[in-house]
Interface confidence: low
């Protein structure tokens, strides 16, 4: 039969500094021995030799001594190349050329990537800001690859596209530092977010800055809360921020503060007649008494539960009054999925197997994605169920039915849509008669 050389169609994505495997396989004929094998790995464009195997032995690396074959696997037709300590300069196409009696070759692409750091934000000018002032916000993120895509948005998530200047500079290692500058005219207050996206890793690095300009005293009470929901993990404490603008000469004796559930109007906590009236909500709330006089009416909610999720209203009454609602979004991370296989022994190509992916005690409901070893989504024959326990936390069970090929890796990704937390599990099934899990 004709010699077939196979490589992955999709680029191999490797992080800078890690090791990458450039997969290549060929179909050895019966009676094949390594003495017959001639294998060359070379750079596709320049034809520079990278690694070779000839005359029955590994001829070694011709590429900075950072490559290796898998000698124990060559006889089975596995000509894959291990590239160590990947650098930006390694990016490109590598050709695997196999010559026995017949010959064949195929090229595999290496896509190098490096995650961007969490952006740092600077403000110029950074003090005595008033509405109407023009400020320059700089967002800087470092040591990523390839070039980033930078997005700015305001507190409502509305894109800010005007007056943005982004520059990207590569260092000696080829990694990029990105600096993006946004010029804005301040409103009454505002949150400005910068998102630096690595388009290969689909990794987003976020930072934001909230600017509250000083105001001229007007006598009106202005109550301010974050525009975005407060996200809190189950079992942790959450701060529902609320602030108001006290007039000169303000004293706590004048303050009437009520926190209540926005929908039911159930009282949560109050401060009246110059003192904290305490929690009316399962004794799990507290104010920040030392900060009230400065206009900080924030509420601490302890040991957050799923049932706490919703909108809380902060109502401030002095001579004037005002209120604002803040949303609490409760979340709990999903556990690393456990994978089970049915049937789980004596598996052969063509068998239909049921792979179950189970992840526990998350909130809110998960999104489940399956994919094969090449990262191609598997959307058919998937059944996902989610059940809430007494605490409102979800256990997710996703079942994939698949017909086995010669071998295959099946990955399950359980995403918490609020935390943007991904929990992964995978199972690799080889085409030889096998048992799962593998026996020792």
């Amino acid at each position: 039969g004709a010699l077939e050389v196979q490589v992955p169609e999709d680029p191999v994505v490797a992080l800078v500094g890690t090791d990458a495997t450039l997969c290549c396989s060929f179909s050895p004929e019966p009676g094949f021995s390594l003495a017959q094998l001639n294998l060359i790995w070379q750079l596709t464009d320049t034809k520079q030799l990278v690694h070779s195997f000839a005359e029955g032995q590994d001829q070694g690396s011709a590429y900075a001594n950072r490559t290796a074959l898998f000698p124990d696997l060559l006889a089975q037709g596995n000509a894959s190349l291990r590239l160590q300590r990947v650098r930006v300069a390694d990016e490109g196409s590598f050709t695997c050329f196999v010559s026995i009696r017949d010959f064949g070759s195929a090229a595999v692409s290496l896509q190098v990537a490096a995650p961007y750091s969490k952006p740092s934000m600077t403000l110029e000018p950074n003090k005595d800001l008033r509405p109407g002032d023009t400020v320059t916000i700089t967002c800087s993120s470092y040591q990523g690859y390839p070039e980033a895509e930078v997005f700015w948005q305001d507190g409502q998530g509305v894109p800010l596209t005007g007056n943005v200047t982004t520059s990207q500079m590569a260092n000696e290692q080829g990694l990029f530092d990105v600096h993006s500058i946004l010029r804005v005219v301040l409103g009454a207050n505002g949150t400005y977010s910068c998102l630096v996206r690595n388009p290969v890793l689909q990794q987003d690095a976020h930072s934001s800055v909230t600017i509250t300009p000083q105001r001229s005293p007007t006598g009106a009470v202005e109550v301010q809360v974050p525009e975005d929901p407060v996200v809190a993990l189950v079992g942790t404490d959450a701060t529902l921020r609320c602030s108001f603008s006290p007039e000169p000469g303000f004293s706590l004796a004048q303050l009437n503060l009520i926190w209540q559930l926005t929908d039911t109007k159930q009282l949560v906590h109050s401060f009246t007649e110059g003192r904290d009236q305490g929690s009316a909500y399962a004794n799990r709330t507290a104010l920040f008494p030392d900060l009230l006089a400065q206009g900080n009416a924030s509420l601490r909610l302890q040991r957050v539960r799923v049932a706490d999720e919703g909108s809380f209203t902060c109502f401030v009454s002095i001579r004037d009054f005002g209120s604002a609602a803040v949303s609490l979004q409760v979340a709990a991370p999903y556990s690393k999925p456990s994978m089970t296989l049915e049937p789980n022994k004596d598996l052969r190509p063509g068998d239909t197997v049921t792979i179950t992916c189970s992840s526990y005690r998350g909130y809110p409901e998960a999104e489940v994605f399956w994919q094969d070893g090449q990262g191609v989504p598997l959307t058919g024959n998937v059944t996902t169920s989610q059940m809430a326990n007494e605490q409102g936390l979800f256990d997710v069970h996703s079942v994939l039915r698949v017909v086995l090929g010669a071998n295959g890796t099946y990955s399950c990704l359980v995403r918490n849509p609020v935390l943007q937390q991904d929990a992964h599990g995978s199972v690799t099934i080889t085409g030889q008669p096998m048992t799962f899990p593998p026996e020792a």
Partner: antibody
């Protein structure tokens, strides 16, 4: 104010080629991904192509690969779509749209019409 | 590719009436966006990332959903809301649109 103005639509014979342009203003063009989306005579919307802010990453649906080429000139704030081997099924209004994070199309041009007919 | 099915294909509502239209995906998607198109005009973004209101869109519009089931709601129908509404998924390439729901005023 964000403005996207497409041009270049025309009547073309089957097998012919055409290049569409989209002039952008009112935002920092070089910071945003851009896309082409078309609307067929039966009013269905179809994504045609996407290009990242720096032009490094380009995506097409399989049905358009090889025949359509998206490109951009950030110095000129202009997006392009080169089309070849045109067929009657390519008859549509072609819209250029700014593409936020490759998630959604936040601003659209007024469209330019391509008719493929003998 | 992910197929989006919008229902109903055509509907009508009286001014002040609550309107809900749905978009069903053939497999789970991460985000859904919604666009409004009036005859002779280009589409306009209404809702992004499933539930966020685009700039300048009236608060009577809202979006919700997850997994394979999404909806667009108009709390009180107004004459200017008569248009065709399209959903669009972001989860996997190719990005796809629904076939549209035509909303008419009674």
């Amino acid at each position: 104010e964000v403005q996207l103005v497409e041009s270049g639509g025309d009547l073309v014979k089957p097998g012919g080629s055409l290049k569409l342009s989209c002039a952008a203003s009112g935002f920092t063009f070089s910071s945003y991904g851009m896309s082409w989306v078309r609307q067929t005579p039966d009013k269905r919307l179809e994504w045609v192509a996407t290009i990242s802010s720096g032009g490094s990453y380009i995506y097409y649906p399989d049905s358009m690969k090889g025949r359509f080429t998206i490109s951009r000139d950030n110095a000129k704030n202009t997006l392009y779509l080169q089309m070849s081997s045109l067929q009657s099924e390519d008859t549509a209004i072609y819209y250029c749209a700014s593409d936020y994070g490759s998630r959604y199309f936040d601003y659209w041009g007024q469209g330019t019409t391509l008719t493929v007919s003998s | 590719q992910i197929v989006l099915t919008q229902s109903p294909a055509i509907m009508s509502a009286s001014p002040g009436e609550k309107v809900t239209m749905t978009c069903s995906a053939s497999s789970s998607v991460i985000y859904m966006s919604w666009y409004k198109q009036k005859p002779g005009s280009s589409p306009r973004l209404l809702i992004y990332d499933t539930s966020n209101l685009a700039s300048g869109v009236p608060v009577r519009f809202s979006g919700s959903g997850s997994g394979t089931s999404y909806s667009l709601t108009i709390s009180r129908m107004e004459a200017e809301d008569a248009a065709t509404y399209y959903c669009q998924q972001w989860s996997s390439y190719p990005r796809t649109f629904g076939g549209g729901t035509k909303l008419e005023i009674k």
